[in-house]
Structure formats: C-alpha cells, structure tokens
Interface confidence: low
C-alpha cells in the first residue's frame, strides 16, 4: 500500500526524559489514535516500525537497534532507551503496517539535563495537599514497567536538594512519601530517585513533582461577596462615571469552577442597550483561595441607568450567592435663594 494514514506530529505528547536514565515510550497509535491494541494488531499480521528525525534535521532515519548493550531496543509497542543520551532528542515515528494497511504518528522526544539538585527544564506535575488535613501521600510517578515485581529497587526521596531523613512531618515509605500533616512550609519540589539493577548494570530513575499545599475542604465555605455591601452607596449624577466593584472570596476547592458575573435588571450586561464594560482581576492566597474582582463600569451614566438594579453573582461547587449594589441618583444641592426660601414658605 502506497498510502499511509499520517496522524502528523502529536505535539500534545511532549515527552521529556532525563539524560543517562532509562526511558520507555509507548507508541501513541494504540493509546490515542487507533481503536485496537498492539496485541490485536500483531495477531492480524501488522508490523510496528520505528524511525526518527534528529533534532534540527529533516532526514528520517531508522533507529539503530544494534548499539552496544542494546541501548535502544523495542519490546511490543514500547521503545526502550537503556539509558538515554542527549543526542537522542528528536521526533520519533511509529508506523503500523502490512501490505494493505498503514498508519503512523510522530511525537517529539526531548532528552533534558538536570543539575545536581534536580533542577531542569522538565515540566513538573503538581500534586496538591490539603493544609492540616491528616496523613496524605504522594507516590513516585511513572516508574511502572521499568523493572519486574521481583526486583526490589532502592528509593531515595529529596526535598529540593536535601535528602529526606529525620524530617518532622515527612516520612519516606518506599515509593510513597507520607505527610503526617501538611503545612505551607511543605511547598516545594520533591524528587524520588529509584535505583534498580538490570543485567549487571545499575539504573536510576529520577522523578520530580511540585507539592502545593492548598486550603482544606474542612474549611471550605460558599463564595463570600465582600463588595457590593450594605455599607456603600453608589451615588452619582447623570454624566458621571459609575464604577462598582464586585469582590468575591472563594475557598480553595479541588476541580471547582469559580464564577462571578453581573446582572443589570436581571439580564446579562451584553443584553442591555447601555455602554457597559467589565474588567476582571484574580488573586490567590498562599493556599490557593481565590479572590475575584469584577469592576462594572459605565462611562457616562444616565438617570435611567441609576434606576436600574445591579446585582453581583458568584458560584462555586459550594454554592451560589448574589448581592445587589445600592445605586442612587445624587440629589443636587439646593440653591439657597430660591429653593431654601421656598422651603421656609416664603412667597
């Protein structure tokens, strides 16, 4: 078959691996593009072919599977590096084919260097721990499939540059790191180094993740509207600018969508025939509680606008709240000669 279903370069999978460490990379065809797995494909007589394009080159070339100590090998739908080298960086293609069928996808592989404190350009996963919530654990990620269950690796945990030993509230437990009680001071990068033997050689796997201590669900409350409130009256004369801030506090809630919006006379501002703009700013506390401010602005307010109802709404997974702003037309100051005199009943 001349034609090949080409899924192009799958940049969604920016694979990053550390230099001088083993890496196992599954062909993305079976995980994201095809409806059957490798075993089915293999049984149907399809062959999986690997090739690559070096960094800053256009030429596709076969992968050399005859390197000393089988440094690069293929096993089923997995491409193995034992270990990687910096110049393995490039775009890798896996192609599944027989005489009548062909499908292929490319993906970028970046071999990155780390310094002696595990700093690197690697994008780090973030693991959130609840503050003062009781025992919570993180697990050394992405180490499955590197060694059989009969092999017992040694695992060393580090916080930043320092080996975790005799820490007050952080205890290494093999592949897990237990936080007896998490505090803000536990924020930082945690690294597990897994060392295992294979065929007379020793390999290291380095995995770093960022721990972020966040607000506990025990302390979570529905959104709190700080502004508008009953103490502030927005009194304006026609022609002046009306500015009303809606400031809302949201407790941190895992995977909650926090929303703030204004209604004017019960409608969205876009549905009202007035020149209104809304600017939003967001700030976060150290535990990722969120404060959102939406400022409603009408440049030149009319007396009609000053009679409208302006309501700020907020919603999170904990509930929905609303608060109306008190908006009034400023009563012009009386002119003494006429109005005050009238007031005293003068004729």
């Amino acid at each position: 078959s001349e034609r090949c279903d080409d899924w192009g370069l799958d940049t969604m999978r920016q694979i990053q691996v550390f230099e001088d460490e083993p890496a196992r990379i599954k062909c993305p065809l079976f995980e994201h593009f095809l409806k059957f797995n490798y075993s089915t494909a293999h049984s149907a007589g399809l062959t999986l072919i690997w090739y690559w394009t070096r960094q800053d080159r256009d030429l596709e070339e076969p992968i050399n599977f005859r390197l000393p100590e089988n440094r690069i090998s293929k096993e089923k739908d997995v491409l193995w590096f034992r270990p990687t080298l910096l110049n393995d960086t490039g775009n890798y293609t896996c192609m599944l084919r027989n005489t009548t069928y062909c499908s292929k996808v490319a993906f970028p592989l970046e071999v990155v260097q780390k310094d002696s404190c595990f700093n690197s350009p690697m994008k780090l996963p973030v693991h959130k721990l609840y503050i003062e919530y009781g025992i919570q654990r993180i697990t050394c990620p992405n180490v499955d499939g590197y060694f059989p269950s009969s092999v017992k690796p040694t695992i060393t945990w580090y916080m930043g540059c320092y080996k975790i030993q005799n820490f007050n509230n952080v205890i290494p437990e093999g592949m897990n790191l237990s936080f007896l009680i998490a505090f803000i001071s536990n924020n930082g990068n945690y690294t597990c180094v897994v060392t295992y033997p294979e065929n007379g050689r020793t390999f290291h796997l380095t995995r770093t993740l960022t721990v972020k201590v966040v607000g506990s669900p025990k302390n979570a409350v529905p959104p709190v509207i700080h502004s508008p409130n009953d103490h502030v009256v927005y009194e304006k004369e026609p022609g002046e600018e009306l500015l009303i801030p809606c400031t809302v506090y949201f407790s941190f809630l895992m995977d909650s969508r926090n929303e703030v919006w204004w209604t004017i006379d019960g409608k969205k501002p876009d549905d009202i025939p007035i020149d209104v703009t809304i600017n939003e700013s967001i700030s976060h506390s150290r535990t990722e509680d969120e404060t959102r401010t939406q400022i409603l602005s009408i440049k030149k307010v009319t007396s009609e606008d000053l009679k409208r109802s302006y309501v700020c709404h907020a919603r999170s997974a904990k509930g929905e709240v609303a608060k109306a702003a008190t908006v009034k037309q400023k009563v012009p100051a009386p002119r003494y000669t006429v109005e005050l005199a009238c007031g005293f009943g003068a004729t």
Partner: antibody, heavy 120, light 110 residues
Framework: EVQLVESGGALVQPGGSLRLSCIVS????????ITWFRQAPGKGLEWVAT???????YYASWAKSRFTISTDTSKNTLFLQMDSLRAEDTAVYYC??????????????WGPGTLVTVSS | DIVMTQSPSSLSASVGDRVTITCQAS??????LAWYQQKPGKAPKLLIY???TLPSGVPSRFSGSGSGTDFTLTISSLQPEDFATYYC????????????FGGGTKVVIK
Amino acid sequence: EVQLVESGGALVQPGGSLRLSCIVSGPSLSHFDITWFRQAPGKGLEWVATISPGVSTYYASWAKSRFTISTDTSKNTLFLQMDSLRAEDTAVYYCARGGVGSSWKAFDLWGPGTLVTVSS
Amino acid sequence: DIVMTQSPSSLSASVGDRVTITCQASESISTALAWYQQKPGKAPKLLIYKASTLPSGVPSRFSGSGSGTDFTLTISSLQPEDFATYYCQQGFSSGNVHNAFGGGTKVVIK
C-alpha cells in the same frame, strides 16, 4: 575546543576581599555547570561552589556566608567573589566544568588554577 | 554526607609495575565514581568516570572497576609519566552538591 582559564589570584590581607574570574572559551557558558574547587598547599581537593547558569547556585556550608559565585554570560566569564578572607583560604583555586545531569557528575575540564594567598 | 576513603595514601612502584588503588564509599554510590590524576603544580585530569568508563585520550593501561561501596583504579603497566597523585570522587549524592573527593594516593618512584 573548550578551555577554562582562571585569573585574579593575589596576595591579600586577612579580612580582605578578592574576585576571581574564570574565562570559558568555546561553547556558551550557559550550556553547562561550572564549579570552583580549591586546594590548599600539600592538601586534597575541596569543593567551594557550583553554578548552573539560569538555574541555581550552590555553596559548601563554610563558603555560603563569605563567597559568591556568579556569571556574566555575555562575556562567558564565571566569578568567585571572596570576602572576609582568612589564612585558611590560602589555596590554588580551580574552575572546572561538571557533567550536568549525568548521574556520575565527573569534572571533565579544568582550568590551570590561580593562587590566592591570605597573609599579613 | 558520603565519605570517600582512599588507600594507600602513598605507594612506591617501578616503571612496568601493575598498580592498584582502592577507594571506599561510606554508603552505596552505585557506579557514580570518577578518578583523577594530578601532577605537581597542575590541575587534576579526569581519568575515569562512571567507575569504569575512560574519556577519549586516556591510555588504555588505566582501568576502573567496582560498584556500590568498593572501587579500584588499576594501572596495568606503570609508565614514567604516571607518577602523580590520584583522587577518587563520588558523584552519586545528588541531594548533596558536595561531590566528595577521597584523600588522594601519591604514586612515587621506588
């Protein structure tokens, strides 16, 4: 070919300051870690400080308060600012290129060294 | 900290001799060990890294072996230019930037 050359070594009085330079010829300084070592007369090698350009600086515990490592990547130069010098800081100071990211972290390239003598 | 102990601290040998220097780590460092040669008034020169790998340009009479805590540097046939001080250095402890050197072994003419 990459070369490292230190300079700035001198005779200085106790309590004085000195700034050592290490010029790196060849690839950009930002491509690898550079480390300062020192060797007192007749003694072994001692680590002083390491810089990973754009990432971090690291110091031996005894050097943290008195020594500062920095780079000027535009000039491809590494510096070691040494303050409050003491007689025991007398040594040949070497800059060396380290194996960034390598699990063995060997130092494959060294400068010839520059002599710092602290004496009154 | 991982402490590196080198032995002997000095040895005398003749040209053509087989010379062995040992280095012991206070805890396992896998194969993360380097060996350096230093001559008087000169900077150290990397001889071996990763316990047994020779950088290009290092003569094949130098070899390294070992893993875990015990390592050996062997010079199969000592040459006149090999009289120098040899240092081992551990590079395993990533959580401790202080890449520890052994105390050194001085090889002198018998």
